[in-house]
Interface confidence: low
């Protein structure tokens, strides 16, 4: 494991006094109920805290909310409950914070059963002032801001009406009834599924997918027989019932539903599901569930059209019951993803891909670590990291793996070293190179966060006992120092730092408990005096990402290019600063066959990089549809991997083939698409079985 508190560590001098001068306590005058915290805007220092205390009575729930505001990153809070007329706020809707730096906030109030509609409180000045607005409907979901214009809001009502506001919630208009799911698309487009029979729960698979580009003046039905739909990057996905009525197939559009292609993916039955694990404007990671209650499926990666898919990973863990998957995009290094597979012996094992799903390998264990009891060979094993599935299973894992785009190469995760994920108490492991190598950084489970673009890592031990100590590292987790932030330990509930990992402030949340009362308390620690000076050129060093063999000319080439970064030296204790920008130098690589995926009708035999034609497409029940009718597809068998920037080198040219295959999808063809003006039949029904998982783009 990493060196602890010994001489090898570059210790920060006099840190206790420096941190003590920058530790701010705030005790909230509240009975302990629930607390939620939201940052308003970027680099504004504004935090809103909503505390809620519920008293469940037989007939109704009586509650009390308090709203607090800080404008100095949590060092001081002011009670602003009077700005919302001391109203009880519905915690299940949370605080709807506007995109970017709009300064907009919407709070949804609890109203009495007999009221005509709901009530919201709106602020457009970073919660300095609020306006009370009574709604003409009862909201079913949190208000959804248009990504392009935060004045435009979308909401579903409990009666399944779709409501739009164009003036930040001041005035609302119902634009459609019997709506099951609605989402903002690009350029102010709204997509939604509707059932004109009125039920959302019973008729999955009989929904219409509709689109409006003028906020409800007119509508276009872009697809029928819809089970569900999702948006990811430039892609619009719809799972559509096939002719047999029991199977569903994925259809993809890159023009907002004007035209559709059928994805070259296996169809699924009613007990299975599709899930978009990740998507950008270039490609998609799609999980396809296996038949039965297996708890696993297969990951496919798409081409740039979203229609041709290559098998990426089999036996991918994704539970049917809870919908948990360990799939994680390691945002601190391009092309890196981790997830878990369910092995034949039912053990869960971690795998990592450094090339956007091209190949998956076990995680290399720390050099000096011993294999645990799960290992058959005590010398040969790998690191396994805990993610959503471990948390859902109730293991002692307080946090998901953590990485930040501006903390290049840095990854923190709970894990164990063996043949499979262990149910034993996990430790915290840190990688500084995007997951290629790891060190054991902390014994036992911890909460952790990244500050100052990786310049500081802060951790707090996960314990059922009250705590009063934090640990911090200024060298990417190699060495740790401890600071006692209060004499009176608190029951810890959460660690909060501004999203984006640019801040140098950390807030420790918890409660104190005496014989009769318990109160919320926060401690905000500013690390600015620990990192006394701004970093200079001499504090940075050149680092080649994905480097595994420095002798190889193509070393570091991933998806056709390599990148050199300026990284902060571990020995430098200085501030990257809030305006820090990652400095990187890309260089293009020569193409090899690994830069291409096999086009439709071709496949790669095992241990071969060449794409071979599927003999007469035998044994393949995959249907390939272009624009909902029979088409010719010309291909040379290879297609550049989405996002691959290679040039020169291998240029796989094959004789051009004509592939013709009848499309048997009963998907609605564009020429049959109909337009209509506003207004449709009434009806009601609940939003059922459609959800967005943690960082998962779309799950049916």
């Amino acid at each position: 494991s990493a060196p602890g508190e010994d001489e090898e560590c570059g210790r920060v001098r006099d840190f206790v006094a420096k941190l003590a001068n920058n530790t701010h306590q705030h005790v909230f005058d509240d009975l302990r109920g629930s607390v939620s915290l939201s940052w308003v805007g970027d680099s504004t220092g504004v935090i809103l805290v909503l505390t809620t205390f519920h008293v469940p009575l037989v007939i109704m729930t009586f509650g009390q909310s308090k709203l607090y505001r800080s404008e100095d990153y949590g060092k001081n809070f002011k009670d602003i409950t009077d700005l919302i007329n001391n109203t009880f706020i519905r915690t299940e809707f949370g605080m709807a914070i506007g995109p970017e730096n709009s300064g907009k906030v919407v709070l949804t109030a609890e109203v009495s059963g007999g009221s005509r509609g709901g009530r919201i409180f709106r602020s457009s000045d970073f919660a300095k002032n609020f306006v009370q607005t009574d709604l003409p409907f009862h909201p079913l979901t949190q208000m959804m801001y248009s990504p392009q214009n935060s004045d435009y809001l979308l909401a579903l009502s409990t009666e399944n009406g779709l409501w739009v506001s164009k003036n930040f919630g001041g005035k609302w208009e119902e634009i459609h009834k019997t709506v099951c799911l609605a989402k903002w698309g690009r350029k102010g487009t709204i997509f939604f599924t509707a059932n004109h029979n009125g039920s959302c729960s019973n008729d999955r698979g009989m929904l219409e997918l509709e689109r409006t580009t003028d906020y409800g003046k007119s509508f276009k039905t872009v697809a029928s027989k819809i089970y569900s739909f999702g948006l990811g990057g430039k892609f619009l996905f719809a799972s559509v019932m096939t002719g047999k009525g029991t199977l569903r197939a994925i259809h993809v559009s890159v023009d907002d539903g004007d035209t559709w292609n059928m994805a070259q993916l296996p169809p699924v039955g009613h007990e299975q599901f599709y899930s978009i694990l990740a998507a950008n404007d270039e490609m998609v990671f799609m999980h396809v569930d296996e038949p039965g209650d297996s708890g696993f499926g297969t990951i496919y990666v798409s081409d740039d059209r979203g229609t041709v898919y290559s098998k990426s990973l089999e036996r991918h863990l994704y539970t049917t019951t809870g919908g948990e998957t360990d799939f994680i995009n390691v945002t601190s290094l391009r092309g890196v993803f981790t997830t878990s597979i369910l092995a034949e012996d039912k053990s869960v094992q971690s795998v990592i891909s450094f090339d956007q799903g091209g190949e998956w390998v076990p995680l290399r264990k720390p050099a000096d670590s011993k294999c645990d009891a799960t290992a058959r060979d005590p010398e040969k094993c790998s690191l396994h990291i805990h993610a959503a599935y471990s948390i859902a299973t109730g293991l002692n894992v307080p946090m998901l793996p953590l990485s930040e785009p501006n903390a290049v190469g840095l990854v923190l995760a709970h894990g164990s070293v063996g043949d499979a994920i262990s149910v034993m108490r996990p430790d915290v492991y840190v990688s500084d190179d995007g997951g290629y190598t790891w060190i054991k950084a902390l014994e036992g489970p911890h909460y952790y966060t990244i500050l100052d673009s990786g310049g500081i890592i802060v951790a707090i031990e996960h314990s059922s006992r009250p705590i009063n100590v934090i640990k911090f590292s200024t060298d990417e987790g190699q060495c740790w120092q401890t600071y006692t932030f209060t004499r009176d330990p608190i029951y810890f509930t959460g660690l909060a730092s501004e999203p984006g990992a640019r801040s140098m402030n950390i807030s420790i949340w918890g409660f104190t408990e005496s014989f009769l009362t318990s109160q919320w308390v926060s401690y905000t620690i500013d690390f600015k005096d620990i990192l006394e000076r701004n970093c200079e050129e001499k504090d940075y060093t050149i680092w080649l990402a994905h480097s595994t063999d420095p002798e190889d000319y193509e070393d570091g080439c991933i998806l056709g290019y390599k990148e050199q970064f300026l990284r902060l030296r571990k020995s430098s204790v200085c501030q990257n600063g809030r305006d820090y920008v990652v400095t990187k130098q890309p260089s293009i690589c020569l193409c090899s066959l690994e830069d291409f995926l096999c086009d439709f009708g071709y496949y790669r035999p095992e241990n071969d990089s060449k794409c071979v034609e599927q003999p007469e497409l035998k044994g393949h029940d995959l249907e390939f549809c272009l624009y909902g009718r029979e088409e010719h597809l010309t291909t040379n068998g290879y297609r550049k991997i989405p996002g691959d920037k290679c040039q020169g080198g291998v240029n796989p040219v094959r004789e051009v083939k004509d592939l013709k295959k009848k499309c048997t999808s009963n998907f609605l063809s564009p020429e049959k698409q109909n337009s209509k003006s506003n207004g449709s039949a009434g009806g009601s029904g609940g939003l059922n079985d459609i959800f967005e998982a943690q960082k998962i783009e779309w799950h049916e």
Epitope: D293, T320, T321, L342, D345, V348, Y389, T393, A420, V423
Partner: antibody, heavy 121, light 109 residues
């Protein structure tokens, strides 16, 4: 409080049938795999059958395969064991148990009080 | 099929003493999939240990589990009167899904 309550046991002749029920309460039934485990008089524990949370997958010990059928009704929070072609060696106390995670085995953490099945002429 | 053999068949000890119960597998078992149960006369079994060494909820810390591969041990550091019972080890595998050991009877000397 998490509870499992078996019922349906009794005396039955060889070759006969019996249906055991297990009523679950205090937890989200559909999220858990469930098992039947039996214990013959004066003997040890023997696993009989298991069923996944959704009911989509079922598993049986070789000694009961083809004769016993495990099922569940998640809307009623109830687990069933349909036993047919019963033999004298099926005589035992039958326990309903909770617990199997994919990839983790957290043990059978909840057991019912058991129901007695006697197969005799 | 993996066979679990527990030893000794019967263990006679006095309250306050230390008890060591053994469970040996016919082939290697992942420690993540080994559990121990306690059963008192006329009662249903109770889960003590899962994952070879993790104590189940509410189990006193005098109970501990250890081992890997084919050899596993349940240790009761200081016997209390209520600890005298039959103890079973169990593994979770593929076919059959679960197998139990034949049990060790812990009786008062």
């Amino acid at each position: 409080e998490v509870q499992l309550l078996e019922s349906g046991g009794g005396l039955v002749q060889p070759g006969g049938s019996l249906r055991l029920s297990c009523a679950a309460s205090g937890f989200t039934f559909s999220s858990y795999a469930m098992n039947w485990v039996r214990q013959a008089p004066g003997k040890g524990l023997e696993w009989v059958s298991a069923i996944s949370g959704s009911g989509g997958s079922t598993y049986y010990a070789d000694s009961v395969k083809g004769r016993f059928t495990i099922s569940r009704d998640n809307s009623k929070n109830t687990l069933y064991l349909q036993m047919s072609s019963l033999r004298a060696e099926d005589t035992a106390v039958y326990y309903c148990t909770r617990g199997r995670g994919i990839g983790y085995y957290n043990g059978m953490d909840v057991w019912g009080q058991g129901t007695t099945v006697t197969v005799s002429s | 099929e993996i066979v679990l053999t527990q030893s000794p068949g019967t263990l006679s000890l006095s309250p306050g003493e230390r008890a060591t119960l053994s469970c040996r597998a016919s082939q290697s078992v992942s420690s993540s999939y080994l559990a121990w149960y306690q059963q008192k006369p006329g009662q249903a079994p109770r889960l003590l240990i899962y994952g070879a060494s993790s104590r189940a909820t509410g189990i006193p810390d005098r109970f501990s589990g250890s081992g890997s591969g084919t050899d596993f041990t349940l240790t009761i550091s200081r016997l209390e009167p209520e600890d005298f019972a039959v103890y079973y080890c169990q593994q979770y595998g593929s076919s059959p899904m679960y197998t139990f050991g034949q049990g060790t009877k812990l009786e008062i000397k």
